[in-house]
Amino acid sequence: EVEKTACPSGKKAREIDESLIFYKKWELEACVDAALLATQMDRVNAIPFTYEQLDVLKHKLDELYPQGYPESVIQHLGYLFLKMSPEDIRKWNVTSLETLKALLEVNKGHEMSPQVATLIDRFVKGRGQLDKDTLDTLTAFYPGYLCSLSPEELSSVPPSSIWAVRPQDLDTCDPRQLDVLYPKARLAFQNMNGSEYFVKIQSFLGGAPTEDLKALSQQNVSMDLATFMKLRTDAVLPLTVAEVQKLLGPHVEGLKAEERHRPVRDWILRQRQDDLDTLGLGLQGGIPNGYLVLDLSMQEALS
């Protein structure tokens, strides 16, 4: 808390300019009018204020706007945004994408801070959904943003927004998140032809069910091993050797290197060894010839 002192003669600030860098904290408190500061916030960002001087400027704005800053001030906070706490930001009503961009720019190159997370949360809640322009902006600044959302939050992403998603934006998504995103992607890309569709849907396939993988195997897509290894195990297990061979095309040889890892390992255990041998890769661990495979889940359903 800065003590209230009278402004020295001749030091009253008539505008926000570089001369203020020479003001001590108490002089800033005494000589800078909060309303002047609010109307000239855009100038603050060009002036090399110290950490402590910024504290004083923030204090002045807090006194002027105890219920939260108006968007006209928020948009021009610049690096004063770094002084805001999540509690401060929860008082804001940010509706303009330009305001969001301006504040994300301040934090550019750094990890997503609690302040930024709160800002994004306020913005998205205010909009009601993650529209394409917002998603475009957020993933441009934070490629991992999408994967930081819960499945419930992802459910508010409209299929049209999926066009803004790049493969690297999904790198850290877990299967539960891809389960939500995949159907949206399938809907978004449904009017594309085979090869183009596969290029777009590929990074979402970690959420694909068995029937969609079977359908893809009929389209000569040549899925790479990295994509195959990210598929849901429960979706891969029912695929036949012939279907996996068609799905992977020339990449099928890569199965040998991955035979000890999921989902390949679990899939091998479900295949007849005879069928695996047709691949000529030396995959071992399949069901020996002459053994009968009972699907107990089917038996339970019938009883």
């Epitope: 860098i21 001590k24 090399p48 950490y51 001087q53």
Partner: nanobody, 119 residues
Framework: EVQLVESGGGLVQPGGSLRLSCAAS????????MGWFRQAPGKGRELVAY????????YYPDSVEGRFTISRDNAKRMVYLQMNSLRAEDTAVYYC????????????WGQGTQVTVSS
């Protein structure tokens, strides 16, 4: 204890260039604004360049604007002053200083490095 150590001074001809460096040790730099001052014989200290903690905002007085450039590398704990188009009146001892308060109130000072501009 915090220390600021300047280097890079020397004798240079008018119109020439010099680059001064300021190395910081101790718990300093990333949160501090940094300034370069100079003091000519018989005169007071004069601020010639000032840079914010993040490094993206700077201030120069009219006497050096367009000729001097201040920069910093927080990872290396260094601050630099690039001086071009040097004049005889730039001759002085140059000091590096650090502040968290204001541009008129410094917490730490270096010992200085002599810059002489003469033909």
């Amino acid at each position: 204890e915090v220390q600021l150590v300047e280097s890079g001074g020397g004798l240079v001809q008018p119109g020439g260039s010099l680059r001064l460096s300021c190395a910081a040790s101790g718990r300093i730099l990333s949160n501090y604004n940094m300034g370069w001052f100079r003091q000519a014989p018989g005169k007071g200290r004069e601020l010639v360049a000032y840079i914010s903690w993040g490094g993206s905002r700077t201030y120069y007085p009219d006497s050096v604007e367009g000729r001097f450039t201040i920069s910093r590398d927080n990872a290396k704990r260094m601050v630099y002053l690039q001086m071009n188009s040097l004049r005889a009146e730039d001759t002085a001892v140059y000091y590096c200083a650090a502040t968290i308060n204001s541009a008129s109130d410094y917490d730490y000072w270096g010992q200085g490095t002599q810059v002489t501009v003469s033909s």
